[in-house]
């Protein structure tokens, strides 16, 4: 039994960080393997993580780690059994994926603006809490090339536009993701889709 | 939110006994070592004892001046961590804090404290 | 056991100034890039409150004027511009080892 692609890891910078790998055939991992970390620091505590199937050859290990901070370094040891598979180390900051925006709603009853709200999904006391940006992506049901991107670089978790900007009469839908520059995270997965049907009063055009 | 609540102390003859609670929530309890630091009136901070978590074996470890008195013990379906203390002498009078660490052992949680009185 | 040795035991300083508080290990607490070192800062009635960690990191929440810096046996927090909520007795403690051993606090005071 032998690793064919390294654990590669990635953290929530909450409570979890997600490694995966491939072996080098068809493996039950939670039977067959475990994952063990632990913090470098001396007096820390050791760790297991169970891993799960993740494709035929693919593992996947949920580390939980509450209190992550930009010193912590991690020591991870993949087992099979009595056999040590791999050893290497993980420091969470250096590779962040932020957890997902939560509850994006789309506020139609302002006259003609779309208000686009969501939840930062960090708690206040999260370092991440204040750093996250936003990107929002807009896009029709019925036109494929109808697709856009929104930038969100103030703190704020909302977007307004102009509900003339978009076609009227027409079903739309729109997601959220994050990512914090200070971390130079990779982009969170984007939150669920969340769908209105676009209509304004034109305005009146004199001949 | 991390929380610490000890209880159990109180006012206990020398050679008494008395056992120290501490109720811990907001944070996965089973990860974590925990250890009792107590501060005699108007004194210093001293470390007391250490229990690790299953990962580490629930390995016990001591203060020389309360080895062989004190048994730190926990239970991690109810999340708490307890002092017992034997033989009780009036030097063992001190604020006890139940303290959580962050990392290896340095410790960003404390709960407010249960006051022993040994006396006469 | 290490023994942890802390200087001045007091400390009267003007506001806006600053405050320097030494501690002193009996041997090394530092090992692998990784220095030992930790600081706490307690107030009348209440527990400690951890204020650097790791020598030099500074805990979240903790104002920008705490710093601490150092290695081996010899380590420092300075405070700077002191404010009057400042005023507490300040406590370094190593995690070399097990005993875990505490210095013998500095009271901060303002001049």
């Known amino acids: 039994m032998k690793v064919l692609q390294e654990p590669t890891c990635v953290s929530d910078y909450m409570s979890i960080s997600t490694c995966e790998w491939k072996m080098n055939g068809p493996t039950n991992c939670s039977t067959e393997l475990r994952l063990l970390y632990q913090l470098v620091f001396l007096l820390s505590e050791a760790h297991t993580c169970i891993p799960e199937n993740n494709g035929g050859a693919g593992c996947v290990c949920h580390l939980l780690m509450d209190d992550v901070v930009s010193a912590d370094n991690y020591t991870l040891d993949l087992w099979a059994g009595q056999q040590l598979l791999w050893k290497g180390s993980f420091k969470p900051s250096e590779h962040v994926k932020p957890r997902a925006p939560g509850n994006l709603t789309v506020h139609t009853n302002v006259s003609d603006t779309l208000l686009l709200t969501w939840s930062n999904p960090y708690p206040p006391d999260n370092y991440l809490y204040n750093h996250l940006t936003y990107a929002v992506n807009i896009w029709s049901e019925n036109d494929p090339a109808d697709f856009r991107i929104y930038n969100v670089t103030y703190l704020e978790p909302s977007l307004r536009i102009a509900a003339s900007t978009l076609k009227s009469g027409i079903s739309y839908r729109a997601r959220v993701r994050a990512w914090a520059q200070c971390y130079n995270t990779t982009w969170s997965e984007w939150s669920p889709s969340t769908k209105w049907h676009n209509s304004y009063r034109e305005p009146f055009e004199q001949h | 939110e991390v929380q610490l609540i000890e209880s159990g102390g109180g006012l206990v003859q020398p050679k008494g006994s008395l056992k120290l609670s501490c109720a811990a929530s907001?944070?996965?309890?089973?990860?974590?070592?925990m250890d009792w630091v107590r501060q005699a009136p108007g004194k210093g901070l001293e470390w007391v004892a250490r229990?690790?978590?299953?990962?580490?074996?629930?390995?016990?470890n001591y203060a020389d001046s309360v080895k062989d008195r004190f048994t730190i013990s926990r239970d991690d379906s109810q999340s708490m961590v307890y002092l017992q203390m034997i033989n009780l002498k009036t030097e063992d009078t001190a604020m006890y804090y139940c303290?959580?660490?962050?990392?290896?052992?340095?410790?960003?949680?404390w709960g407010q404290g249960t006051l022993v009185s040994v006396s006469a | 056991d290490i023994v942890v040795t802390q200087s001045p035991a007091s400390l009267a300083v003007s506001l806006g100034q600053r405050a320097t508080i030494s501690c002193r290990a009996s041997?090394?607490?530092?090992?692998?890039?990784?220095?030992?070192m930790h600081w706490y800062q307690q107030k009348p009635g209440q527990p400690p409150k951890l204020l650097i960690y790791?020598?030099?990191n500074l805990e979240s929440g903790v104002p920008a004027r705490f710093s601490g810096s150092g290695s081996g046996t010899d380590f420092t927090l300075n405070i700077h511009p002191v404010e009057e909520e400042d005023v507490a007795i300040y406590y370094c403690?190593?995690?070399?080892?097990?005993?875990?051993?505490f210095g013998a606090g500095t009271k901060l005071e303002l001049k």
């Open positions: 303290v959580r660490h962050r990392g290896g052992a340095w410790f960003a949680y």
């Open positions: 907001g944070f996965t309890f089973n990860m974590y070592a």
């Open positions: 229990i690790r978590s299953k990962g580490s074996n629930f390995e016990t």
């Open positions: 041997k090394s607490v530092s090992t692998s890039g990784y220095s030992y």
């Open positions: 790791l020598a030099s």
């Open positions: 403690q190593h995690s070399r080892e097990l005993p875990l051993t």
